[in-house]
């Protein structure tokens, strides 16, 4: 009875979600086994997000618009674990959007979900950030390691998608 | 005020290469947005080929994507179009123009465009 | 691609009259859709960004609205000048993709 109503809820929150989300997969997590974390298909998950690559080129405003859209947000990385998981799915002759702008152009980042930047976690390139004007962050693969560069806000860029994980 | 100047043959036999050059004054090329070549064929139908950008990267319209190459020389603050193995299809007028203004919300500042007619 | 389709083709209007091009785009936009002005032998001349912002030094007879797929540009009160050919191009996703034109003729 009680695994019964369980299964209950969680189609009923499936049906929820699948009006956002056509197709979620989901995988049993718990030291039970009995929660289900699910990540949109074709999304990839990571600890507690899921992640999207948008290979669509949109100025840094849209494609944070873009992920918005999908209940996500451009890509805050807050660890070198997540960020080696993002780019196995990354091309190394394109750059990304990340969730990271200096929208004054005074040196002060910020994360667009107001994660406190922190200096002592970042993984810009050697001689990055190098211009006020560049107000936006990318990931590329630059001098055989993958970092960030500050870049022209406007110029239309791929980007990376993150939202949390639907628990269910 | 930045001003964009296309200049190159306006004619160009079937087969060949057509290259082109927009002359940028005003702002340098190297300093911010991107830098685009579109054409308008015969018929007034408007087409984006592709751009390269003020850090030199590129981005070419799939539908040209073997025959294009966009390039620059920062020195003279040009920006240079070239399409292989031209047909009659690519006569058009070829504007240069830039792109990123209003947050890339449209584009404000064109060339005054050059016809190149491809005929034997 | 996200394809344009800008109507009507052609259009005749006279002097001081009231005239509306719309442009239909084949996925949601968000808005990020532009218009121009083309005289003959000429480049094009941004007249709206973003739907609805005018360009600087643009009458304010000019108007854009719309929002996701259908998108409208008015012209109130023609004037001489205003004839010509006019353009849409969405702005959201690279290629930007244009209308196939809108030819204002006067009546």
């Known amino acids: 009875n009680f695994m019964y109503s369980k299964t209950v809820k969680r189609l009923s929150k499936l049906q929820e979600y699948q009006q956002y989300y056509p197709s979620l997969t989901c995988v049993m997590e718990g030291k039970d086994m009995e929660d289900w974390s699910c990540c949109p298909t074709p999304w990839t998950s990571f600890q507690s997000s899921c992640y999207f690559i948008s290979t669509v080129m949109q100025s840094w405003t849209k494609s944070q618009n873009n992920c918005s859209v999908m209940g996500a947000d451009l890509v805050v990385i807050n660890t070198k674990e997540e960020q080696d998981f993002i780019t196995q799915n990354l091309k190394i002759n394109s750059a990304y959007f990340l969730g990271l702008s200096d929208p004054k152009g005074w040196r002060h980042w910020q994360w667009v979900d107001q994660t406190p930047y922190n200096k002592n976690v970042t993984f810009w390139h050697s001689g990055e950030p190098n211009s006020p004007d560049e107000r936006c962050a990318i990931i590329n693969f630059r001098s055989e390691e993958w970092g960030w560069n500050d870049v022209h806000c406007h110029v239309p860029q791929k980007s990376i998608c993150k939202m949390k994980k639907i628990y269910i | 005020d930045v001003q964009l100047q296309e200049s190159g043959p306006g004619l160009v036999k079937p087969s060949q290469s057509l290259s082109l050059t927009c002359s940028v004054t005003g702002y340098s090329i190297t300093s911010g947005y991107y830098w685009n070549w579109i054409r308008q064929f015969p018929g007034n139908k408007l087409e984006c080929m592709g751009y390269i950008s003020y850090d030199g990267s590129n981005y070419y319209n799939p539908s040209l994507k073997n025959r294009i190459s966009i390039t620059r020389d920062t020195s003279k603050n040009q920006f240079f179009l070239s399409l292989n193995s031209v047909t009659t299809e690519d006569t058009a007028t070829y504007f240069c123009v830039r792109g990123g203004d209003y947050d890339d919300g449209g584009f404000a500042y064109w060339g005054q465009g050059t016809l190149v007619t491809v005929s034997a | 691609d996200i394809q344009m389709t800008q109507s009507p083709a052609s259009l005749s209007a006279s002097v001081g009259e009231t005239v509306t091009i719309t442009c239909r785009a084949s996925?949601?936009?968000?808005?990020?859709l532009a218009w121009y002005q083309q005289k003959q032998g000429k480049s094009p001349q941004l007249l709206v960004y973003n739907a609805k912002t005018l360009a600087d030094g643009v009458p304010s007879r000019f108007s854009g609205s719309g929002s996701e797929t259908q998108y409208s540009l008015k012209i109130n009160s023609l004037q001489p000048e205003d004839f010509g050919n006019y353009f849409c191009?969405?702005?959201?996703?690279?290629?930007?993709?244009f209308g196939g034109g809108t030819k204002l003729e006067i009546k």
């Open positions: 191009q969405h702005f959201w996703i690279i290629p930007y993709t």
């Open positions: 996925g949601n936009i968000h808005n990020y």
